[in-house]
Amino acid sequence: MAVTACQGLGFVVSLIGIAGIIAATCMDQWSTQDLYNNPVTAVFNYQGLWRSCVRESSGFTECRGYFTLLGLPAMLQAVRALMIVGIVLGAIGLLVSIFALKCIRIGSMEDSAKANMTLTSGIMFIVSGLCAIAGVSVFANMLVTNFWMSTANMYTGMGGMVQTVQTRYTFGAALFVGWVAGGLTLIGGVMMCIACRGLAPEETNYKAVSYHASGHSVAYKPGGFKASTGFGSNTKNKKIYDGGARTEDEVQSYPSKHDYV
């Protein structure tokens, strides 16, 4: 029962995580204009992996796609690739895990096959989550680097009479969605791997051998030999520890500019 619960929970957590990774990848707010130096702007800029947007205080929002591949920074391409790989692996993992679910009967599928599929999907979720976390972290690192570079430029180029306010970008909502989603997918994957150990048939019962003691007709039958897995008693009634790992989904608040202003 605990195995089924762990597997089911792992599946649900991974499903939410992958939905989050997809949402983060599609979101436009990977980086948002830093309003520290100009909090009263009537024009608010934000950028995603696929397009950049400008929201005016009038309510008008204009988004432009990046219609070039070669002209984009290598880091952005790498982030895109990591997120897509994460989504693809996650989607395949979900497909595999559906068939691996203990509560779903498909023909006469053996427990060992379900265990293998559960492990496969678990590993896929773990890699998917890691890809998402890596992608978001690479983008965040890129933002931090650019932020401090533009800050340095701001204070070196102030010699003239005319002020040119350079647009600096800070973390957008998508980064937080991506981190949380990647973490959830990772946790879901770990749970699937734990569930797999509970599904695997661990008992190899050797055939009973009769030992005839001289002068006696009493047969001695030794008990079934346990395969040394480090887990305890009978597989059929096995209970594995359900740690009930929880993540607190913190809602990250960041300056949302106007209504588009």
Partner: antibody, heavy 119, light 113 residues
Framework: EVQLVESGGGLVQPGGSLRLSCAAS????????MHWVRQAPGKGLEWVSY????????YYADTVKGRFTISRDNAKNSLYLQMNSLRAEDTAVYYC????????????WGQGTTVTVSS | DVVLTQSPDSLAVSLGERATISCKSS????????????LTWYQQKPGQTPTLLIY???TRKSGVPDRFTGSGSGTDFTLTISSLQAEDVAVYYC?????????FGAGTKVEIK
């Protein structure tokens, strides 16, 4: 057809208060930011205040900050400007205008209401 | 705050001649995000309310005659009336719509010589 009609202007003594209203029609009022702009007799245009569509962002000119309060009632399609501690230099024609167009441009303007601050 | 300096204060031009109004900003009004300049031009005819002529520094509002042209970028902007007509007699204002407060220029009065 977009229409903005201001009301509430009049003669008031220095230090007094007045509340201007702007009734909007012909467009989805709740979707657009609104502005108050004034013009003193024989002078140029002076931007006074702005309120975003959901009242989340509000800005004022330095000359009126702390004395004027902008507000809106989207249910009534109305914009308001509460003017307190009025001074002689606040005498002007007050226009309400909407950022209905691209580029934050003030596309539609009302006909204006005259506020005279005098003893 | 952004300070807009308009010049000249007034301008007398013969019918059919070119009229040029300058507007200089104390800060750049150029937005990198969409490569647009957030400066707007308005026309106010005597006894009337202001009307929008040009937004994004150079984009004519639909219905505005093509003799009105906006140009410039960053801090220096120009409104040109290529062939002045009698109905163009008005005061012209530039406005910063990039950051609050949305300041106006002092205005340029265009008259017929």
């Amino acid at each position: 057809e977009v229409q903005l009609v201001e009301s509430g202007g009049g003669l008031v003594q220095p230090g007094g208060s007045l509340r201007l209203s702007c009734a909007a029609s012909g467009f989805t009022f709740s979707s657009f930011g609104m502005h108050w702009v004034r013009q003193a007799p024989g002078k140029g245009l002076e931007w006074v205040s702005y309120i975003s569509s959901g009242s989340g962002s509000i800005y004022y000119a330095d000359t009126v900050k702390g004395r004027f309060t902008i507000s809106r009632d989207n249910a009534k399609n109305s914009l308001y400007l509460q003017m307190n501690s009025l001074r002689a230099e606040d005498t002007a024609v007050y226009y309400c205008a909407t950022s209905y167009y691209y580029g934050n441009a003030l596309e539609y303007w009302g006909q204006g209401t005259t506020v005279t601050v005098s003893s | 705050d952004v300070v807009l300096t308009q010049s000249p204060d007034s301008l007398a031009v013969s019918l059919g001649e070119r009229a040029t109004i300058s507007c200089k900003s104390s800060q750049s009004l150029f937005n990198v995000g969409n490569q647009k300049n957030y400066l707007t031009w308005y026309q106010q005819k005597p006894g009337q309310t202001p009307t929008l002529l040009i937004y994004w520094a150079s984009t004519r509002k639909s219905g505005v005659p093509d003799r009105f042209t906006g140009s410039g970028s960053g801090t220096d902007f120009t409104l040109t009336i290529s062939s002045l007509q009698a109905e163009d007699v008005a005061v012209y204002y530039c406005q910063n719509v990039y950051s609050y407060p949305l300041t106006f220029g002092a205005g340029t009065k265009v008259e017929i010589k």
